[in-house]
């Protein structure tokens, strides 16, 4: 904490302008009156204050709104938002995208994840819901910032918004949040034909149930082994050789390549040897040929 | 323009780590494998392991397993390999390498970083 | 594991000259899962050829590959200054994934 001095009369500072980075840290703290420095927060990103001044400034507007920065404050915050903590940022309330893309514009290039993160969260609960605007705002000044929000946000997206959806957009979702927007991209893109869909709902998938997975092998889709892999663990187990097969279609060779990796290996041990032998690609690990399989969880369930 | 930027030189003691990166641009890092090649001075190419930076799932060469730790973040888009226990066998120039996912051949490499192992 | 040995080591030849550089591999390897790569001094490896006999974006056409099981080759029909290089095969289809010795081309 900075320590408490008195400020001298030739310092006393009327407004917020270049010549206080001539000041030292205690000066600052003594000089510059909080409420002045929230009036005239546009002013200060325009100045090339040093970081041990910014958290002087920071240090004011923490005393001077313990309970969380008004957004007329967010919002010019520039520079001045890298110095935020996300505990910080939790007490905000923020509803204005312009303050937003202000920030974001702000965090980039920067180690912000989780100030981001935080940050949108707190836009989305200020507007209520992820509505398309804020759905537009975000992949256009940070794409893959939709999949900071937790499963929870993103309950809140209405499907009509999932066509403004990019696949760089969701490149970060984890299966928790594609399970929550696979159902969602499905009803939205329920009218489309065969291949048009599989192209829309494909960065989707890590968030599909195996009877969906089932029903594109089916279909022709020749999925590549980057979309296979990223299906759910789940998914992909009760595959039967020839549906994977089918879900592939010449891209079935790639099993070979990825045999060791998650979800392709579970697969793989999964099935009989005699079935994988039908591919051809010289998989091993299978269930050998004349070996029952006793699935223990069942009979479990029913003593 | 697809590229793996990789960090500078680097000069370690023996039994020391190293934890290289390998930042990736133009392209989806979630769509292709990370893998990671060794060469010593003059000498050829040694495959030390693969990550799949969707899910962090990693596979590596026996000879380097326990030692080497394949890692991604996928907000910065920068794969990461650390190497532990360093002995002056370690000196050698590593590279990250994109491979898509399915096949077998790395069509962009890395920078390369060196890393001298010496007391 | 299983070992790709590379021959000549190094070599030089003429420009004008139809190279052949070969692959053997210790046991039979798909010929989907075999490339070629190119490397100059002081940079990183390029691309050069993919399972087996496709050209990589960017490669002259005078270059070509070819082989199956356990022998490979690439092939330049006429040699310039600048495929002066060391050429690595690169095997995929076992773990774990390895490469040749290399071989050192240079011009004459």
């Known amino acids: 904490d900075v320590e408490r001095t008195t400020c001298p009369p030739e310092k006393e500072v009327h407004e917020i302008d270049e010549s206080l980075i001539f000041y030292k840290k205690r000066e600052l703290e003594a000089c510059v009156d909080a409420a002045l420095l929230a009036a005239q927060m546009d002013r200060v990103d325009a100045i090339p204050f040093t970081y041990e001044q910014l958290d002087v400034l920071k240090h004011k507007l923490d005393e001077l709104y313990p309970q969380g920065y008004p957004e007329s404050v967010i919002r010019h915050l520039g520079h001045l938002f890298l110095k935020m903590s996300p505990e910080d940022i939790r007490k905000w309330n923020v509803t204005s995208l312009e303050t937003l893309k202000a920030l974001l514009k702000v965090s980039k290039g920067h180690e912000m994840s989780a100030q981001v993160a935080t940050l949108i969260d707190r836009v989305v609960v200020g507007r209520g819901q992820l509505d398309k605007d804020t759905v537009d705002t975000l992949t256009a000044f940070c794409p893959g910032c939709l999949c900071s929000l937790s499963p929870e946000r993103l309950s809140s997206v209405p499907p009509s918004v999932i066509g403004a959806v990019r696949p760089q957009d969701l490149d970060t979702c984890g299966p928790r949040q594609l399970d929550v927007l696979y159902p969602k991209a499905r009803l939205a893109f329920q009218n489309m034909s065969g291949s048009e869909y599989f192209v829309k709902i494909r960065p989707f998938l890590g968030g599909a149930p195996t009877e969906d997975v089932k029903a594109l092998s089916q279909q022709n889709v020749s999925m590549d082994l980057a979309t296979f892999m990223k299906l759910r663990r789940e998914a992909v187990l009760p595959l039967t050789v020839a549906e994977v097969q089918k879900l592939l279609g010449p891209h079935v060779e790639g099993l070979k390549v990825e045999e060791q990796h998650s979800p392709v290996r579970d697969w793989i041990l999964k099935q009989r040897q005699d079935d994988l032998d039908t591919l051809g690609l010289g998989l091993q690990g299978g269930i050998p040929n004349g070996y029952l399989i006793l699935d223990l969880s069942v009979r479990e369930a029913l003593s | 323009e697809v590229q793996l930027q990789q960090s500078g030189p680097e000069l370690v003691k023996p039994g020391a780590s190293v934890k290289i990166p390998c930042k990736a641009s133009?392209?989806?890092?979630?769509?292709?494998?990370m893998d990671w090649v060794k060469q010593s001075r003059g000498k050829s190419l040694e495959w030390i392991g693969d990550?799949?930076?969707?899910?962090?799932?990693?596979i590596y060469n026996q000879k380097f397993e326990g030692r080497a730790t394949l890692t991604v973040d996928k907000y910065s888009s920068t794969a990461y390999m650390e190497l532990r226990g360093l002995t002056s066998e370690d000196t050698a120039v590593y590279f990250c390498?994109?491979?898509?996912?399915?096949?077998?051949?790395?069509?962009?490499w890395g920078t390369g970083t060196t890393v001298t192992v010496s007391s | 594991q299983l070992v790709l040995t590379q021959s000549p080591a190094i070599m030089s030849a003429s420009p004008g000259e139809k190279v052949t550089l070969t692959c053997s591999a210790s046991?039979?390897?798909?010929?989907?899962?075999l490339s070629w790569y190119l490397q100059k001094p002081g940079s990183s490896p390029k691309l050069w050829i993919y399972?087996?006999?496709n050209l990589a974006s960017g490669v002259p056409a005078r270059f070509s590959g070819s082989g199956s099981g356990t022998s490979y080759s690439l092939t330049i029909s006429s040699m310039e200054a600048e495929d002066a290089a060391s050429y690595f095969c690169?095997?995929?289809?076992?773990?774990?994934?390895?490469f040749g010795g290399g071989t050192k081309l240079e011009i004459k």
């Open positions: 390498a994109r491979r898509k996912t399915g096949t077998g051949y790395f069509d962009v």
């Open positions: 133009g392209y989806t890092i979630t769509d292709y494998n």
């Open positions: 990550v799949f930076p969707y899910n962090g799932d990693s």
């Open positions: 046991s039979s390897v798909s010929s989907t899962y």
């Open positions: 399972s087996t006999s």
């Open positions: 690169h095997q995929w289809s076992s773990y774990p994934y390895t």
